[in-house]
């Protein structure tokens, strides 16, 4: 049988995905970090 | 408040095309997840769902009666319309049409009925 | 078609005393969304049906709390914790995760 038709079950939650690169000066390389949600989370 | 209402005639001939209409308030065809359904009742017996339309025109029809049924909408007039053609006295029902909204903040239910029409399939 | 078989058909019941009808589906009802689409309407004599109880067991808004509604699968059942005069009418359950939307054959509810 052909489903009905419904929502998805789930709710999708849209937050915003920043990457960003802060130069350390004197220090070897450069820190590289994914900010999600406000959360540094790499 | 929401509230629907069926119209049609109370009588129609075998072999004949019935068209009834439900015209709605508190609510518009026009909100995203919303759409409207008929269903029947033929006297003492159990309710059989007929068809359902959406706010975005999308339309589902019980297979059994698909080839007889046609749906659609008018959303500025606050009205749905349901046709059956080729009329037989097993057609002989009170006629329903309720709301359904999808949604996963809506109860996802026919949660508003109308009173209902009773339409007479007879010679 | 999932047909939706109930039982029992009639049910007497005396006022304050506990009701449960059963509600059974040909097939599993759940959704590929992994939602159930069971409800439960009431017909009261002479009344346009009215939900009562959607996706199984949620309450509809003004439904009193003495409904419930439980299952999964293809086995539901309605409980009325206490009848009361009011409840009279026929209960259909309803499924509507497949088309065509299927409804059992109905319960009538009477007062002993």
């Known amino acids: 049988d052909a489903e009905f038709r419904h929502d998805s079950g789930y709710e999708v939650h849209h937050q915003k995905l920043v990457f960003f690169a802060e130069d350390v000066g004197s220090n070897k390389g450069a820190i590289i970090g994914l900010m999600v949600g406000g959360v540094v989370i790499a | 408040q929401v509230t629907l209402k069926e119209s049609g005639p109370a009588l129609v001939k075998p072999t004949q095309t019935l068209t009834l209409t439900c015209t709605f308030s508190?609510?518009?065809?026009?909100?995203?997840?919303?759409?409207v359904g008929w269903i029947r009742q033929p006297p003492g017996k159990a309710l059989e769902w007929l068809a359902h339309?959406?706010?975005?025109?999308?339309?589902s029809y019980n297979p059994s009666l698909k080839s007889r049924l046609t749906i659609s909408k008018d959303t500025s007039k606050n009205q749905v319309v349901l046709t059956m053609t080729n009329m037989d006295p097993v057609d002989t029902a009170t006629y329903y049409c309720?709301?359904?909204?999808?949604?996963?903040?809506?109860?996802?239910?026919?949660?508003?009925w109308g009173q209902g029409t009773t339409v007479t399939v007879s010679s | 078609d999932v047909v939706m078989t109930q039982s029992p058909l009639s049910l007497p019941v005396t006022p304050g005393e506990p009701a449960s009808i059963s509600c059974r589906s040909s097939?599993?009802?759940?959704?590929?969304?992994?939602?159930?689409?069971l409800e439960w309407y009431l017909q009261k004599p002479g009344q346009s049906p009215q939900l009562l109880i959607y996706?199984?067991?949620n309450r509809f808004s003004g439904v009193p709390d003495r409904f419930s509604g439980s299952g999964s699968g293809t086995d539901f059942t309605l409980k009325i914790s206490r009848v009361e005069a009011e409840d009279v009418g026929v209960y259909y359950c309803?499924?509507?995760?497949?088309?065509?939307?299927?409804f059992g054959q109905g319960t009538k509810l009477e007062i002993k």
């Open positions: 309720a709301r359904r909204q999808l949604g996963l903040r809506s109860i996802d239910a026919m949660d508003y």
């Open positions: 508190g609510f518009s065809l026009s909100t995203s997840g919303m759409g």
């Open positions: 339309i959406w706010w975005d025109d999308d339309k």
């Open positions: 097939q599993s009802i759940l959704h590929s969304n992994g939602n159930t689409y």
């Open positions: 996706k199984v067991s």
């Open positions: 309803m499924q509507s995760s497949f088309v065509p939307l299927t």
